[in-house]
Interface confidence: low
């Protein structure tokens, strides 16, 4: 019996290097480690609300409080970062709202990356008033422990003054910190008394000491950097999508699959099809056809568009998404009506997602 090939018999060789796939971006809530975070589930008429984090059910514990439509995280840590979802279950349907939580010291030392206020830290002294180095803004130095997700930017600041103007140098784990000690080096902004490391990696963990000195004295301050490795998750598909649809013969229809994935996802659209008038082979198993495929002659693989549909196009359409961690799939049904019947959007019923490690 003949098998089905990919769209227009394309081979599996990608024509160009895969690019980072443009995925749906949920709202992002940012908190610093130790802070408390409260998020309200932005869904209407929510009788029963359930919560998930990275696709896994979230229950209350000593730091996570679930009250009505509110999620509270007390004393947030970088491990609380991830993709959250609240699902409102109603009598006839359910709806899901996604949001990201990012617990990070992304730009550390309590300061914006562009250092707009940095010039205030550069104190000019009267030339006759000799003075040993001193800290000019200890508030920006209070937080000594910085836990930062990998790939983020870190900035440590030691705003100081003195006369003559002190110099600043940096040590890592008590030894001179050289540019070649890390891939990509680092930046020192002397005018802002700051050390900046972009795209941190686990090997950047350690103690960073600023030494500020002039001929009248020396002061130092040590920060501890912990780089938290991100745990990517398998793809998560927005509940309710793809949605069941109906159209008349000759009409057009679109199925949409919204994907949340922090690793590049690969999307497939698969259909149960008929062969020789049957949906099942002699072995009782369904015939399948891969209709669309991200990365192979496909644009916007999150959308499957069907034009000029016939009755043969009716049936179940599966959106299957994978990344290097795992995969998930959800499906929807297309009903094709005779031309005299007016089409209507069906109630959105979600097939059970198949989340797999």
């Amino acid at each position: 019996r003949p098998s089905f090939s990919l769209v227009e018999d394309t081979t599996l060789e990608p024509e160009e290097p895969p690019t980072k796939y443009q995925i749906s971006q949920p709202e992002v809530y940012v908190a610093a480690p130790g802070e408390s975070l409260e998020v309200r589930c932005l869904l209407k008429d929510a009788a029963v609300i359930s919560w998930t984090k990275d696709g896994v059910h979230l229950g209350p514990n000593n730091r996570t409080v679930l009250i009505g439509e509110y999620l509270q995280i007390k004393g947030a840590t970088p491990r609380d970062s991830g993709l959250y979802a609240c699902t409102a279950s109603r009598t006839v349907d359910s709806e899901t709202w996604y949001f990201m939580v990012n617990v990070t010291d992304a730009i550390s030392s309590g300061d914006d990356e562009d250092d707009t206020d940095g010039a205030e830290d550069f104190v000019s002294e009267n030339s006759n008033n000799k003075r040993a180095p001193y800290w000019t803004n200890t508030e920006k130095m209070e937080k000594r422990l910085h836990a930062v997700p990998a790939a983020n930017t870190v900035k440590f600041r030691c705003p100081a003054g003195g006369n003559p103007m002190p110099t600043m140098r940096w040590l890592k784990n008590g030894k001179e910190f050289k540019q070649e000690h890390r891939i990509g080096g680092y930046k020192v902004r002397n005018q802002h008394w700051s050390l900046i490391m972009e795209s941190v990696v686990p090997s950047d963990k350690g103690n960073y000491t600023c030494v500020v000195e002039n001929e009248y004295g020396s002061i130092n301050h040590t920060y501890h950097l912990d780089v938290v490795e991100r745990s990517p998750h398998r793809p998560i598909l927005q509940a309710g999508l793809p949605a069941n649809a109906s159209t008349v013969v000759g009409g057009d229809v679109e199925f949409v699959c919204k994907v949340y994935s922090d690793a590049q996802p690969h999307i497939q659209w698969i259909k149960h099809v008929e062969k020789n008038g049957s949906k099942y082979g002699p072995d009782g198993l369904p015939y399948l056809k891969v209709l669309k495929h991200s990365g192979i002659n496909s644009s916007n693989a999150e959308v499957l568009a069907l034009f000029n549909v016939t009755e043969a196009d009716a049936g179940e359409y599966i959106c299957k998404v994978s990344n290097y961690i795992g995969q998930a799939n959800q499906s929807a049904w297309l009903t094709v009506l005779p031309k005299q019947q007016a089409p209507g959007r069906e109630k959105e019923i979600t097939a059970s997602p198949d989340y797999l490690e």
Partner: antibody
Framework: DVHLQESGPGLVKPSQSLSLTCSVT?????????WNWIRQFPGNKLEWMGY???????NYNPSLKNRLSITRDTSKNQFFLQLSSLTTEDTATYFC?????????????WGTGTTVTVSS | SIVMTQTPKILLVSAGDRVTITCKAS??????VAWYQQKPGQSPKLLIY???NRYTGVPDRFTGSGYGTDFTFTISTVQAEDLAVYFC?????????FGSGTKLEIK
């Protein structure tokens, strides 16, 4: 045409580490695909060991996770297997192979394989 | 991990026979199943992917079918060059796993 070729020692002593190289020609390992190591034990049993993706991410078989490391040298278009704490159970033919992506259901190009015997 | 139970272990065939090999997954693997042919001293060669799609250049006497947990591989008319070991494989869920193999031998 894309070709994969494994190389490494044929004989290794128990408790030592095994290092194998897969040299890829005809395709850049940073352009696409996941680059795998698979081994075949005497008696034909195949075991997927793990892969490194075109962008450098790894996925390992949990049964080997604490002993296995797969790395790459993009300048030489090679990827590597390092398996530590060998026992005689690791005696097998080791293949490198590529797969288009997780869930694509196929290893479309394989190396010829290199036989490794673990024996004192 | 998912176990792929492949049967039979050995198939005694004659040229022209129709041959069917089955693979049963211990849990659903959707259509993420491939079939490989391995001849003595060679590496496995891909024949079927996505359970039923023939790989480029594979003769149409080789077919695959199945979805979920039950998969079959068929050679409609066995030829002498088909004598080999055949493996099924799933990459639906990591760790990816293979069947134990079916050896085609001449009667």
């Amino acid at each position: 045409d894309v070709h994969l070729q494994e190389s490494g020692p044929g004989l290794v002593k128990p408790s030592q580490s095994l290092s194998l190289t897969c040299s890829v020609t005809g395709y850049s390992i940073t352009s696409g695909y996941y680059w795998n190591w698979i081994r075949q034990f005497p008696g034909n049993k195949l075991e997927w060991m793990g892969y490194i993706t075109y962008d450098g991410s790894n996925n390992y078989n949990p049964s080997l996770k604490n002993r296995l490391s797969i790395t790459r040298d993009t300048s030489k278009n090679q990827f590597f297997l390092q398996l530590s704490s060998l026992t005689t159970e690791d005696t097998a033919t080791y293949f490198c192979a590529r797969v288009y992506y997780y869930g694509s259901g196929n290893f479309d190009v394989w190396g010829t394989g290199t036989t490794v015997t673990v024996s004192s | 991990s998912i176990v792929m139970t492949q049967t039979p272990k050995i198939l005694l065939v004659s040229a022209g026979d129709r041959v069917t090999i089955t693979c049963k997954a211990s849990q659903s693997v959707s259509n993420d199943v491939a079939w490989y042919q391995q001849k003595p001293g060679q590496s496995p060669k891909l024949l079927i992917y996505y359970a039923s799609n023939r790989y480029t250049g594979v003769p149409d006497r080789f077919t695959g079918s199945g979805y979920g947990t039950d998969f079959t591989f068929t050679i409609s008319t066995v030829q002498a060059e088909d004598l080999a070991v055949y493996f099924c494989h799933q990459d639906h869920t990591s760790p990816f796993t293979f069947g134990s193999g079916t050896k085609l031998e001449i009667k």
